[in-house]
């Protein structure tokens, strides 16, 4: 069971300091942006991280949403990352959900976070370079020390 608590506005960056944003095709991508670029591209660069109370504490349970014309929420259904047009619900009557991730700090790395899927244990949000695009994907952490699953989350409130 997950019960919604408060929400915060955040900018999410990869290790290259590239900013996560939602492109016109609703794809989550990372791109070089100055602070003014980041502001100019809002709300596509501003993510609503909603925190949830978890009946089985496993880290901070969160959803990640963006409000452009409508609110879309990050999902990892079938291990594929996409934004689904939906509000983060007030309650989820299950111990797993495709939209709930466990946000945890990374040992030895101040201000770095990782996000584990509640639906797929051992699978994390990660940055992957595909041709010239830096994409947000869901990735199994096969090896200790994989830094592609590390992100900076900067509160904008």
């Amino acid at each position: 069971y997950f019960g919604k608590l408060e929400s915060k506005l955040s900018v999410i960056r990869n290790l290259n300091d590239q900013v996560l944003f939602i492109d016109q095709g609703n794809r989550p991508l990372f791109e070089d942006m100055t602070d003014s670029d980041c502001r100019d591209n809002a709300p596509r660069t501003i993510f609503i991280i909603s925190m949830y109370k978890d009946s089985q504490p496993r880290g901070m349970a969160v959803t990640i949403s963006v409000k452009c014309e409508k609110i879309s929420t990050l999902s990892c259904e079938n291990k594929i990352i996409s934004f689904k047009e939906m509000n983060p619900p007030d309650n989820i009557k299950d111990t797993k959900s495709d939209i709930i991730f466990f946000q945890r700090s990374v040992p030895g790395h101040d201000n770095k976070m990782q996000f584990e899927s509640s639906s797929y244990e051992g699978y994390f949000l990660a940055c992957e370079k595909e041709r010239d695009l830096f994409k947000l994907i869901l990735k199994k952490e096969d090896e200790l020390g994989d830094r592609s699953i590390m992100f900076t989350v900067q509160n904008e409130d």
Epitope: L15, N16, D110, K112, G145
Partner: antibody, heavy 119, light 108 residues
């Protein structure tokens, strides 16, 4: 602009502890998001990452050296330090301090200091 | 840990020529978390490229990076006299952070 400068003894005896300090000038070590790092280069060889510290004092070190490495920070002096215990001749190297913006790559380096381990 | 192998060990070229340096990783660096540095004798390394292809501040555009997974390339389109140096690749996709053994670019 921000500059880094290493200091410490150039000669250390085997089995002793190597101690180096890096002074940050032209900016504050408290700048959020930075990791202050140590990297070494054996004579005529490549580079080896030793570890890092944040201004809050959180450290992370290379597993190959971890048991011998201590990294500390003194924000009041704008300095961070490296201690490497039980040194051998294999620890002879140029030691660099460097700034990691938080990603794991190094955009600013000190000039380096040669430390020789010899009796 | 990820081992980075750079080739060739030495590259002998003339000013104005194109230099192509290779860096091969022992396993995939899918995240594209790879950097390149230049080091001149008696000096500290200088960051050239990060994120495979992103030029660091004040780096001239004759330096470019490319590649993915396990194979990465640094290209210097037209060598200037000040470009003769040793070049290192570094991965930051996995801990511990590791560097390649370097490629020396020397004047032919």
């Amino acid at each position: 602009q921000v500059q880094l400068q290493e200091s410490g003894p150039g000669l250390v005896k085997p089995s002793q502890t190597l101690s180096l300090t890096c002074t940050v000038s032209g900016g504050s070590i408290n700048s959020g998001g930075y990791y202050w790092s140590w990297i070494r280069q054996h004579p005529g060889k490549g580079l080896e990452w030793i570890g890092h510290i944040s201004y809050r004092g959180t450290t992370y070190s290379n597993p190959s050296l971890k048991s011998r490495v201590t990294i500390s920070v003194d924000t009041s002096k704008n300095q961070f330090s490296l201690k490497l215990s039980s040194v051998t001749a294999a620890d002879t190297a140029v030691y660099y301090c460097a700034r990691d913006r938080g990603g794991g790559f190094f955009d600013l380096w000190g000039r380096g200091t040669l430390v020789t381990v010899s009796s | 840990e990820i081992v980075l192998t750079q080739s060739p060990g030495t590259l002998s070229l003339s000013p104005g020529e194109r230099a192509t340096l290779s860096c091969r990783a022992s396993q995939s660096v899918n995240s594209g978390y790879l950097a390149w540095y230049q080091q001149k004798p008696g000096q500290a390394p200088r960051l050239l490229i990060y994120g495979v292809s992103i030029r660091a501040t004040d780096i001239p555009d004759r330096f470019s990076g490319s590649g993915s997974a396990t194979d990465f390339t640094l290209t210097i389109s037209r060598l200037e006299p000040e470009d003769f140096a040793v070049y290192y690749c570094q991965q930051y996709g996995f801990s511990p952070l590791t560097f390649g053994g370097g490629t020396r670019v020397e004047i032919n």
